[in-house]
């Protein structure tokens, strides 16, 4: 029974539940936008054709004191495989390029959706 | 906020080449699925390409097939639309525009005026 037990604790999440919990939240974020996201933090805008996760983590988490985000910002850590931190530049952001948080929220969420049809979950 | 600025129209003799550019600001513009849409003088719009946001994928309206190339730089955040053997019937104003079926993520340049006459 012991070695049982093992099949009932949960185990890793699968990717698409990842990602769909990842699309959800972000949903959450944009329905429930009152005031500026954020208050209008800017932040930089990444391309989205590869190392989509780990970039988009180092953008947000230049964000601080920003509880509306702090749940996605944990949840991009979970598909980066390193530990992403503040002041962090990544070569996939745009150069030179700042977008407004609640447009990069948004944009990503459109992203993600197109990678869950695709069945792209990683 | 976000921003689309088109570029490199002009006059052109029937035959030649020009080639248009859309500069895109404000949003994430890599994600974006982009087109091309032109509207010749007192005509309706009318779709002249899209590419989707990898770059991948292109499609063209039968009237330019063969002729016009879309192409995007999402390093440089940039559109581009190759036009080669202009015919008069290509004069009209072209908008570059988001090609997404999501409410919400319509964005729309403001257009380039491109003449073809001798």
């Known amino acids: 029974l012991t070695c049982l037990g093992g099949f009932a604790s949960p185990g890793p999440v699968p990717p698409s539940t990842a990602l769909r919990e990842l699309i959800e939240e972000l949903v959450n974020i944009t329905q429930n936008q009152k005031a500026p996201l954020c208050n209008g933090s800017m932040v930089w805008s990444i391309n989205l054709t590869a190392g989509m996760y780990c970039a988009a983590l180092e953008s947000l988490i230049n964000v601080s004191g920003c509880s509306a985000i702090e749940k996605t910002q944990r949840m991009l850590s979970g598909f980066c495989p390193h530990k992403v931190s503040a002041g962090q530049f990544s070569s996939l952001h745009v150069r030179d390029t700042k977008i407004e948080v609640a447009q990069f929220v948004k944009d990503l969420l459109l992203h993600l959706k197109k990678l869950f049809r695709e069945g792209q979950f990683n | 906020g976000v921003q689309l600025l088109e570029s490199g129209g002009g006059l052109v003799q029937p035959g030649g080449s020009l080639r248009l550019s859309c500069a895109a600001s404000?949003?994430?513009?890599?994600?974006?699925?982009m087109g091309w849409v032109r509207q010749a003088p007192g005509k309706g719009l009318e779709w002249v390409s899209s590419?989707?946001?990898?770059?991948?994928?292109?499609y063209y309206a039968d009237s330019v097939k063969g002729r016009f190339t879309i192409s995007r730089d999402n390093s440089k955040n940039t559109l581009y639309l190759q036009m080669n053997s202009l015919r008069a019937e290509d004069t009209a104003v072209y908008y570059c525009a988001t090609a997404e079926d999501e409410p919400g993520y319509d964005y729309w340049g403001q257009g380039t005026l491109v003449t073809v006459s001798s």
């Open positions: 590419i989707d946001w990898k770059g991948g994928k292109t």
């Open positions: 404000g949003f994430m513009f890599s994600g974006y699925d």
